[in-house]
């Protein structure tokens, strides 16, 4: 990813994902330089004329910024001297996906690195006991996903069991007509067991766990971005 050698500095980027409608971060670090006024940061996007963002002489320079990024970007200005060139992106859109280049010039030299930015929607699932059902069942809901994910159930007691025959999953388009609400119901659940609802697309994987006993219900959920890292 980075370029090193005489007059070149190491620049490191991290593949990351943006959740549409929220803030996103394009991560980039470089060899620090205490001379802030000598640091130039340029962010470019493949297929876009003009810059995504430019920071030089200690401040933002938007004179060459492409219109689609106007008012939507900022570097973490107080962290530039310690080698952070990451870019904050406002209101992530599907069209923000693509290949970006982080280009750095300092008094020590110059370097650049590319990153792949994926965009979609992902959210934490919540599992509840569905008391409306005729038999004991669990309802797993996650408000925003895109592209359409796969949903699978697992259980601690019946490891390796296929729950597709005893579950029903639906995808409901949200009001903005892009993201979807995921609802999956698992039927015929047994007490004193831990069940997991796993939702996954090519951007993220989310898991919700629920343990139902006679006396209590314990829940836990986690979200993991896929393929993120250097």
């Amino acid at each position: 990813f980075g370029i090193s050698g005489k007059h070149f500095i190491t620049v490191t980027t991290f593949t990351s994902a943006g959740n549409i409608g929220e803030d996103g971060t394009l991560s980039c670090t470089f060899e620090p330089d205490i001379k802030l006024n000598g640091i130039v940061i340029q962010w470019l996007k493949e297929g876009i004329k003009g810059l995504v963002h430019e920071f030089k002489e200690g401040k933002d320079d938007l004179s060459q910024q492409h219109e689609m990024f106007r008012g939507r970007t900022a570097v973490f200005a107080d962290q530039v001297v310690v080698g952070n060139a990451s870019l904050r992106l406002k209101n992530v859109q599907l069209t923000d996906a693509g290949t970006y280049t982080c280009y750095i010039r300092t008094s020590k030299g110059k370097g650049n690195a590319n990153l792949e930015y994926k965009t979609g929607a992902f959210s934490m699932p919540e599992i509840n006991v569905d008391y409306n059902a005729s038999s004991e069942s669990l309802r797993c809901e996650a408000p925003r996903w895109f592209p359409q994910p796969t949903v699978a159930w697992a259980s601690q007691v019946d490891q390796g069991a296929n729950f597709s025959e005893v579950s029903n999953t639906s995808f409901e388009l949200n009001s903005e007509n892009v993201t979807m609400k995921v609802v999956s119901v698992l039927y015929n659940v047994t007490i004193n067991n831990t069940y997991s609802c796993m939702i996954e697309n090519d951007i993220a994987k989310a898991t919700g766990d629920i343990k139902v006993t006679d006396s209590e219900v314990k829940r836990r959920s986690q979200l993991q971005l896929l393929n993120s890292g250097p």
């Epitope: 409608g21 803030d23 970007t73 209101n91």
Partner: antibody, heavy 121, light 107 residues
Framework: QVQLQQSGAELVRPGTSVKMSCKAS????????IGWAKQRPGHGFEWIGD????????NYNEKFKGKATLTADKSSSTAYMQFSSLTSEDSAIYYC??????????????WGQGTSITVSS | DIQMTQSPSSLSASLGGKVTITCKAS??????VAWYQHKPGQCPRLLIH???TLQPGIPARFSGSGSGRDYSFSISNLEPEDSATYFC?????????FGGGTKLEIK
Amino acid sequence: QVQLQQSGAELVRPGTSVKMSCKASGYTFTSYWIGWAKQRPGHGFEWIGDIYPGGGYTNYNEKFKGKATLTADKSSSTAYMQFSSLTSEDSAIYYCARLDGSSYRGAMDSWGQGTSITVSS
Amino acid sequence: DIQMTQSPSSLSASLGGKVTITCKASQGFNKYVAWYQHKPGQCPRLLIHYTSTLQPGIPARFSGSGSGRDYSFSISNLEPEDSATYFCLQYGNLLYAFGGGTKLEIK
């Protein structure tokens, strides 16, 4: 600390223009967007538009295009809004505010005290 | 253009109580909703941005939540100085939009 000092109240004739100012201090003027809003009693706030003093870039609410003109003078760290062809509907308090997040257009985090404009013959 | 419909337009609540104000966006989905307090003769004060992030120095009695098109703002343990007009701001799009405001009276 961040401060925005707006010009004083004005009584103006219908059909004329008025130019109000918003002087910024306590931060780098060219690095943050400045937004303008209109407040009429019983009507709440209306977004007029905003300007990035570092490059003169502007965004306008369609409703105020041709009515409001936003400018900025970097040397005096002052933003201006000119309102033209005034009618009684333009009688209101006008606020300027800094948008949080530097070149990223964030929420209006620091406001001026407002400029009251009364249009009357 | 996005419109923000705020409700109620006014409400009265007791000292120590709790109130909730809502704003509904006409379209779109993003977390860029801020809440302000405005008292007569003063400039508006930013309380919450990005749906639920409290501004520095704002007490935890104030809170915000929401997603999609529906956003809410709450004040608990109401104090006399909470008497004011509160309004929301949608700032995710090119054109920002304000809610109509809610006048809160403390009894």
